[in-house]
Interface confidence: low
Amino acid sequence: LVPHLGDREKRDSVCPQGKYIHPQNNSICCTKCHKGTYLYNDCPGPGQDTDCRECESGSFTASENHLRHCLSCSKCRKEMGQVEISSCTVDRDTVCGCRKNQYRHYWSENLFQCFNCSLCLNGTVHLSCQEKQNTVCTCHAGFFLRENECVSCSNCKKSLECTKLCLPQIENVKGTEDSGTT
C-alpha cells in the first residue's frame, strides 16, 4: 500500500530536493528558502530566484523552507525554573535548560520543569543525576526511600510500603517494648 501523503507533501514530492512546486503553477519548481529566511514571494518562473527575506528579530527558521512567516522564538519558562542556555538566532530557536545540579522533569513532550538533584543524605548515590533523571539513591540501614529522600525508619507507618525495608528495625522496637512488659 502507498502511504497517503498530505497535499503539501504531494506537491513537494513532484519537485527535486531543495525545491517546492509553485502554488499557482504546478509546472514551476521554486528553490526553497535557506534557514534563517522565509518566503516573501514565489519565484516568477523556471530558473528564477525565489524572493526570500531574513527573519526579523524574535523569529527564526531552523531549516530550508517555504514558510510565509518565520516562527516565533520560544521563551524559557522561569516559573518552571528554566534558564536560557543559548538565545534565539534567525536560524535557531532559543535553547532552554536547567541550572547546574538540577534535572529536567518532563510533564509532557515539550514541557519540563527543573528540580534540584537529590543529595542522597543518609544514603549513597546509586546513579548520578542526569539531564532528564534525578539521582537514584540507596539508603543506609535504618532509612527508607520516600520521594527520593532517605527518611528514618522511625517515620515508617505500618500501612506504608516501607515496612518491608524497615522490618528489622520495627521488630527490634517491638522486642524492646515486649521485654519491658514481663
Epitope: E79, G81, H105, Q113, F115, N134, E147, E149
Partner: nanobody
Framework: EVQLLESGGGLVQPGGSLRLSCAAS????????MGWVRQAPGKGLEWVSQ????????YYDHSVKGRFTISRDNSKNTLYLQMNSLRAEDTAVYYC????????????WGQGTLVTVSS
Amino acid sequence: EVQLLESGGGLVQPGGSLRLSCAASGFTFVKYSMGWVRQAPGKGLEWVSQIADTADRTYYDHSVKGRFTISRDNSKNTLYLQMNSLRAEDTAVYYCAIYTGRWVPFEYWGQGTLVTVSS
C-alpha cells in the same frame, strides 16, 4: 507542618463548571509558585496549571487553556482553579501543590479532590 486541603470537586455534566479551592497552611504562602496537577484513573500525573508567587503570571497546559483559570488570594492563603466547559477527559483527581524547586515534582501534596465529568 505543611498542609494543603483541596475542595470543590464533584460530579458535573459535560460543558459544566466547577471551582476548586485549596486552603494552604504551615508555610509562607506568598513566597511560592503554586500549581494544580491531576491524575486521571489509571494514568500518570499531568501538569494542569501554575501561578507565580505574586499572581502576575499564570501558565496552562494546552489541553485546558481557555477553559481553566488559576488564581490565588494571598491574603487568604488560598489557591483556586475555575474550570469551565468541562469535558469527559477532565475527569481526574486534582491536586494542589507547591513548587519549591527541590527534589521531586511538587514536593508537598494535598489529598486531592475528585472531579467527574459525565452525563
